[in-house]
Amino acid sequence: AMHVAQPAVVLASSRGIASFVCEYASPGKATEVRVTVLRQADSQVTEVCAATYMMGNELTFLDDSICTGTSSGNQVNLTIQGLRAMDTGLYICKVELMYPPPYYLGIGNGTQIYVIDPEPCPDSD
């Protein structure tokens, strides 16, 4: 598979936001790239979000997506928002070179995202 690199561990912010870079080694000059974030937990894999972008253009996720991102060359900066402690898990970056043919696929080893729910503020009189 195509080589895809991502950090091993990321700690989400207190606001439930986690960011990481997904970098891939392209065999050639792809013009259309698809990036998918998958979450693996208890051997179940679910799609978190996905975006297709043209090289040189911005990465655009669906409006209701919990992901945002920017791209620069063979690097994609991914941000996942609205995370809670129950969302802690392994987040895998999948990269597909869609055009021109041939099709190339790469799967990262995953980024373990730890999410800690903030302690509620004590009531003050």
Epitope: A1, H3, A25, S26, P27, G28, K29, L38, V45, I92, K94, E96, M98, P101, P102, Y103, Y104, L105, I107
Partner: antibody, heavy 115, light 107 residues
Framework: EVQLVESGGGLVQPGGSIRLSCAAS????????MNWVRQAPGKGLEWLAQ??????????YYSASVKGRFTISRDDSKNSVYLQMNSLKTEDTGVYYC??????WGQGTLVTVSS | DIQMTQSPSSLSASVGDRVTITCRTS??????LNWYQRKPGKSPKLLIY???NLASGVSSRFSGSGSGTDYTLTISSLQPEDVATYYC?????????FGSGTKLEIK
């Protein structure tokens, strides 16, 4: 127009050697990983070998059935990929295809291993 | 190594029928699956790449679906020219194993 043209097939005795060539045109050869796939008579498709390109340091991969006997190589200056086949067995008989990462395929060349 | 289990090995259907061929993998291949058509005496032709994407020049009668370990090739309305053998293939990682093939015939 994309073209992959295999050559070098023929009749060879068991234990013998043969070298297949595949000439590519119509696409950027150096940007692609190249593969050899075969189909034995009455059997299905079998992937044999892959050679990656310069960004991947020309890494090579082989199926268990040919590892140690077959060698894949490429010459980007000639837009060509090769398959050196040694210690041939009768079960290596079949049509051999070269393919640019499975999107583009050649017409195939027949290799017959028989005494 | 990733094992590919393709079924059925052969099938006969009528023109206009909806036809489905399935491929199951021994582990999650994350959608890294291609489908090919091979007619006698011809080279294999890529139909579907990445489990769901239609290759250039392929009729929209063909579609692919699935994820994880279970994948399907569907022909929405069988035509006489679809008589061929169909193969799935793992393209996630080496060895890039093919399924055993499904020979499709017209009733």
């Amino acid at each position: 127009e994309v073209q992959l043209v295999e050559s070098g097939g023929g009749l060879v005795q068991p234990g013998g050697s043969i070298r297949l060539s595949c000439a590519a045109s119509g696409f950027t050869f150096s940007d692609n990983w190249m593969n050899w796939v075969r189909q034995a008579p009455g059997k299905g498709l079998e992937w044999l070998a892959q050679i990656r390109n310069k960004p991947y340091n020309y890494e090579t991969y082989y199926s268990a059935s040919v590892k140690g006997r077959f060698t894949i190589s490429r010459d980007d200056s000639k837009n060509s990929v090769y398959l050196q086949m040694n210690s041939l067995k009768t079960e290596d008989t079949g049509v051999y295809y070269c393919t640019a990462q499975f999107a583009y395929w050649g017409q195939g060349t027949l290799v017959t291993v028989s005494s | 190594d990733i094992q590919m289990t393709q079924s059925p090995s052969s099938l006969s259907a009528s023109v206009g029928d909806r036809v489905t061929i399935t491929c199951r993998t021994s582990e999650n291949i994350y959608g890294g699956l291609n489908w090919y058509q091979r007619k006698p005496g011809k080279s294999p032709k890529l139909l579907i790449y990445g489990a769901t994407n239609l290759a250039s020049g392929v009729s929209s009668r063909f579609s692919g679906s699935g994820s994880g370990t279970d994948y399907t090739l569907t022909i929405s309305s069988l035509q006489p020219e679809d008589v061929a053998t169909y193969y799935c293939q793992n393209v996630l990682r080496s060895p890039f194993t093919f399924g055993s093939g499904t020979k499709l015939e017209i009733k």
